[in-house]
Interface confidence: medium
Amino acid sequence: TVPPMVNVTRSEASEGNITVTCRASSFYPRNIILTWRQDGVALSHDTQQWGDVLPDGNGTYQTWVATRICRGEEQRFTCYMEHSGNHSTHPVPS
């Protein structure tokens, strides 16, 4: 088992909103849960966009999940990752 490296980034979206993206990379096996949470509770699927779980050329995999949030509410959102029985939570950078 190779645990993922998780990285959260933010980018400007429409006025007053930002897109936050959570990327998991270099993990094996390919089964992973990656989702955004607001106040600890998972967002619905239709408010998130997922990338495919793709091989990264090193025998491991990568994927991402993104959602759009209101600027100023970043503290309320965290990226939740679960892989091979381990889990972690990652905040939005300020």
């Epitope: 106040d39 600890g40 509770v41």
Partner: antibody, heavy 122, light 112 residues
């Protein structure tokens, strides 16, 4: 389900600050969201803020953003709330409570501390 | 803020009676993930509140089946099918769907 043990009663003077503690045991501290709540005598409850023990991330009720500061010490599995510039309006029982997002997929205040009475008086 | 209004303020009951408590929110309390985070708590004198019901109708672990929750949108109800002495106290409804999370003013269930 674990335990949440809060610090003892406090008698403080107006304008002072107080730091309340909530020591936890019996569960993985860093996995949990912990909220603080206020209850004035004979009244209902108010949610102050939560802190995620794993990252220290917080979310505050705007009413308390200038009043409360939440922190955690993962080495001792303890959550803290510092309340500043106290007035008699801050006299209340303050509770810490643990969220249960895992076992029940969304119960807010599943487990509570016993409360700390804060009295603000000159 | 979402205002949670509970009625009645006081509910005198006889042991063994059914009790019905009402909670109304000032706006729809469906979370953006589609769930309705409406909860009921019981607080007995001198004690911390205890969670009874979460997500409108789910009993928390250890809560007797005489407690049931129902409702949707803005109107919610807690029913106690046969009131026992240990059920006396103040019941609070709570919404966790919109920040700031808010409680109702409470309904005191007491002996008639």
């Amino acid at each position: 389900q674990g335990q949440m043990q809060q610090s003892g009663a406090e008698l403080v003077k107006p304008g002072a600050s107080v730091k309340l503690s909530c020591k936890t045991s019996g569960f993985t501290f860093s996995d949990n969201y912990i909220s603080w709540l206020k209850q004035k005598p004979g009244q209902s409850l108010e949610w102050i803020a939560w802190i995620y023990a794993g990252t220290g991330g917080t979310s505050y009720n705007q009413k308390f953003t200038a009043k409360a500061q939440l922190t955690v010490d993962t080495s001792s599995s303890t959550a803290y709330m510092q309340f500043s510039s106290l007035t008699t309006e801050d006299s209340a029982i303050y509770y810490c409570a643990r969220h249960d997002y895992y076992g029940t997929s969304g119960a807010w205040f599943a487990y509570w501390g016993q409360g700390t009475l804060v009295t603000v008086s000159a | 803020d979402v205002l949670m209004t509970q009625t009645p303020l006081s509910l005198p009951v006889s042991l063994g009676d059914q009790a019905s408590l009402s909670c109304r929110s000032s706006q729809n309390i469906v979370h953006i993930n589609g769930n309705t985070y409406l909860e009921w708590y019981l607080q007995k004198p001198g004690q911390s509140p205890k969670l009874l019901i979460y997500k409108v109708s789910n009993r928390f672990s250890g809560v007797p089946d005489r407690f049931s929750g129902s409702g949707s949108g803005t109107d919610f109800t807690l029913k106690i099918s046969r009131v026992e002495a240990e059920d006396l106290g103040v019941y609070y409804c709570f919404q966790g769907s919109h920040v700031p999370w808010t409680f109702g003013g409470g309904t005191k269930v007491e002996i008639k």
